[in-house]
Interface confidence: low
């Protein structure tokens, strides 16, 4: 006869491990007892359990409550046992020794491998601002046994770098994703993908990118110079910019206070019916926590009674 077992048994941390040991004998042969022991190299054998054909299962004190026979129906030639709730410390070599009648004793070894699935964590990097060079966007760390694979899934262009630290029974892998921040990255997902043989499917953690920026400011409303004449109603200047965080707007007049009747409504400066008093230099100041921008325009209100042409200057400053 001969023993049938597995070279390697693989389980996930916390699962039950079936340690197989089946005697395939000739007709009429019987199994008297099966002894299970842990036999790691350099250490003496540590008894797990003894399975006796007449007296049943005896579990050694060190494994009390953790070693059981598989559920019925049971074959009298099957010496397999269940090791409940496998932990990392259970990883190692195991031996079953089978005493048969009349053929004598047989033994076989197997290796128990305990997979420790990772619990990944994603840490965003420092605040991203347009104009920075290559900057850490996020780092993702996963520790397990064996070492997990950590990759990134994103449409954003960037570079990755990985490092790993080996511990006594596991390995920690950290991957960093670096990028050159630009406003087009705002709202884009950056997903850390962790693969491991102990996971049924990849684990994914997503971070949404936020990039601070402030666009140049410009003023609209003076495109048609001839519309800015005495008596015109509904004249307005609009300040154009965009940013993240969304910017706030402030209007001032460079050559004095804003004329009475002029309404400030966020990015828009609304004028009452125009008079020559509305001529002047107007400044739009745009700011957010990241930066500030200015744009100034010169308004000349035309008097239709005069032949002199209206002058308009547009100046942008940052």
């Amino acid at each position: 006869g001969e023993l049938e077992t597995s070279d390697v048994v693989t389980v996930v941390l916390g699962q039950d491990a079936k340690l197989p040991c089946f005697y395939r004998g000739d007709s009429g042969e019987q199994v008297g007892q099966v002894a299970w022991a842990r036999v790691d190299a350099g250490e003496g054998a540590q008894e797990l359990a003894l399975l006796h054909s007449k007296y049943g299962l005896h579990v050694s004190p060190a494994y009390e409550g953790r070693v059981e026979q598989p559920p019925p129906p049971r074959n009298p030639l099957d010496g397999s046992v269940l090791l409940r709730n496998a932990v990392q410390a259970d990883e190692g070599e195991y031996e079953c020794r089978v005493s048969t009648f009349p053929a004598g004793s047989f033994q076989a070894r197997l290796r128990l491998r305990v997979l420790v699935p990772p619990l990944p964590s994603l840490n965003p990097g420092p605040a991203l601002e347009e104009g920075q060079g290559l900057t850490l966007a996020a780092s993702c760390t996963a520790e397990g046994s064996p070492a997990p694979s950590v990759t990134w899934d994103t449409e954003v262009k960037g570079t990755t770098s990985s490092r790993s630290f080996k511990h006594s029974r596991s390995a920690a892998v950290t991957s960093e994703f670096h990028l050159v921040p630009s406003r087009s990255m705002n709202g884009q997902p950056l997903t850390c993908v962790v693969s491991h043989p102990g996971l049924l499917q990849d684990q994914r953690i997503t971070h949404i990118l936020h990039v601070s920026f402030l666009a140049e400011a410009s003023v609209r409303g003076l495109e048609d110079q001839n519309l800015w004449h005495i008596g015109r109603e509904g004249a307005m200047l609009k300040c154009l910019s965009e940013g993240q965080p969304p910017p706030s707007y402030n209007w001032t007049r460079l050559d004095g206070p804003l004329p009475s009747g002029v309404r400030v409504d966020g990015d828009t400066l609304g004028f009452p019916p125009l008079t020559t008093e509305h001529s002047g230099i107007y400044v739009c100041h745009v700011s957010n926590e990241f930066s500030s921008r200015d744009s100034q325009v010169t308004v000349d209100v035309l008097d239709p009674q005069e032949d002199s042409g209206k002058q308009v200057d547009l100046v942008s400053a940052s």
């Epitope: 965003p124 997902p189 997903t191 499917q201 990849d202 997503t206 971070h207 949404i208 965080p245």
Partner: antibody
Amino acid sequence: QVQLQQSGPGLVKPSETLSLTCTVSGFSLTNYGVHWVRQPPGKGLEWLGVIWSGGSTDYNPSLKSRLTISRDTSKNQVSFKMSSVTAADTAVYYCARSGKWYYFDYWGQGTLVTVSS
Amino acid sequence: DIQMTQSPSSLSASVGDRVTITCRASENIYSNLAWYQQKPGKAPKLLVYAATNLADGVPSRFSGSGSGTDYTLTISSLQPEDFATYYCQHFWGTPTFGGGTKVEIK
């Protein structure tokens, strides 16, 4: 335009398997994930699971053992199965679209599934 | 799982009112938060994603703010069509939704 059309029985017996289909148009299943969310009558929303654009799946851990999500890209269909249902599984079931992350920009019309004998 | 605590569970308001709904996560969700509006018998509609970004076609009276564990949805001037139930949802790992806030007519 983007649409998600749900189909499936409105009544399922206890201990049986609930099966729903989400047929999509206006986008490709190889570019977007399809999620399943449910809402018991008068209650809040609960995320159930997703099949990603690459075909991999993620499930709510509390329901993982009972859920199977699969797809047929040639038919633009996503299939949702929940086994061993009980009265507590009575809810409106929605499919919803997402990119590579977990918020949902387009939703199906919802299917009220009642679990009763 | 990360728990989302939404408050208030209901509120009464009038057209033109400023309405604020808050959502608190049991741990840092790094702005991975969405807000939805749901009307009776209808599917939810995405309003805000990534805490502050307005979804396509959503009126500018809606805005989202917050970071870390605390987030807010604000309706600057309530309109008749805004009476509905609002949900927050995090997408930092396994998604979970807040319990909802029903906005009713005063």
